[in-house]
Amino acid sequence: FSPLRRISIKILVHSLFSMLIMCTILTNCIFMTMNNPPDWTKNVEYTFTGIYTFESLVKILARGFCVGEFTFLRDPWNWLDFVVIVFAYLTEFVNLGNVSALRTFRVLRALKTISVIPGLKTIVGALIQSVKKLSDVMILTVFCLSVFALIGLQLFMGNLKHKCFRNSLENNETLESIMNTLESEEDFRKYFYYLEGSKDALLCGFSTDSGQCPEGYTCVKIGRNPDYGYTSFDTFSWAFLALFRLMTQDYWENLYQQTLRAAGKTYMIFFVVVIFLGSFYLINLILAVVAMAYEEQNQ
């Protein structure tokens, strides 16, 4: 080994070196949280970049760059260090127009803490392993969601556009003429029935067990879907999103109530099956796989 490499190895294995890097990263993170940093922080920024460059140079000199099994670029954690340094110099010396977008990559410096703290490294390793193991479960989940999304599409397509429309129109008004002139929320409230405090028109349906309109209103299919048009089963993608909402139980009871009011209470069966299969079974299957991966990593 050359004297330079011997020195690099000595520095690299020294505990103070690890402490210095960790302190640098933490200080850098503190500086990154500043809202309006003063001018002198620019020099501090250069210092941080210098320390990171020094760290990488030491690692390269001690282990070699990329040829050989234990060299710098053969360790995935060093890829992060390399990217951090490359972006630090890119944003400083190369004029790339939208610098603010590139400055976002400075946040990657915070991730360097993972490679420095051994405990974190283990946890992240386990997380990556669990993601690999999750692929099969994810395929199953997406498949199940797709199947139920297609069923939902067939059962409820267009149903959430059913609204209670005012019957007593002016003598020359028609549904179409009104829809063409409606602009504001206030205009909508004149012609559609809204429950107090509701931001969407009251849903209704055409089957005997679906929601009925109050006196003076009739059920029509017109306008957009509830929740600014985001809640519907009108296309496969919207149906898939609705099913994902059910699986994650994200305000699912609202979707359940809306759909049952528009389609009929019989369709409760669909929701029971989805909640049992998607929410109770698949979610717990995912958790089980993650738990197994952590257990394996610990062993």
């Epitope: 397509m157 267009g158 059913h162 429309f165 019957n167 007593s168 129109l169 028609t174 549904l175 179409e176 055409f206 006196e215 003076g216 009739t218 059920c219 029509v220 299919k221 017109i222």
Partner: nanobody
Framework: EVQLVESGGGVVQPGGSLRLSCAAS????????MRWHRQAPGKQREFVAR???????GYADSVKGRFTISRDNAKNTVYLQMNSLRPEDTALYYC??????????????????WGQGTLVTVSS
């Protein structure tokens, strides 16, 4: 496809009576309001009477007390009973309805539908 067909028109003497009917056909799920309009020769179309699905009614001032609108929800039909007819009631009578129906492909559509009209002539 939804169709509205009017019938019952004809020639009648002043002071006489006529009963117009308008039947809606097709894969109808719900009929909201149903209205009668009329258009005299060389004049604009004017509203005559309306009835909602919960049987609330409304009339034009010119026919109040003389005309009565009713509907049979089971038959998807609206009727216009016209009494004490006057020569100025001579016109082509149109039926209009707000219909929600199941259209091709099984999807639901709501819209305003019109009939072809039935001619009522009041003359001595």
């Amino acid at each position: 496809e939804v169709q509205l067909v009017e019938s019952g028109g004809g020639v009648v003497q002043p002071g006489g009576s006529l009963r117009l009917s308008c039947a809606a056909s097709g894969r109808i799920l719900r009929i909201g309001y149903m209205r009668w309009h009329r258009q005299a020769p060389g004049k604009q179309r004017e509203f005559v009477a309306r009835i909602t699905d919960d049987s609330a009614t409304g009339y034009a001032d010119s026919v109040k007390g003389r005309f009565t609108i009713s509907r049979d929800n089971a038959k998807n039909t609206v009727y216009l009973q016209m009494n004490s007819l006057r020569p100025e009631d001579t016109a082509l009578y149109y039926c209009e309805a707000l219909v929600t129906a199941s259209v091709r492909g099984g999807s639901i559509h709501s819209g305003t539908y019109w009939g072809q009209g039935t001619l009522v002539t009041v003359s001595s």
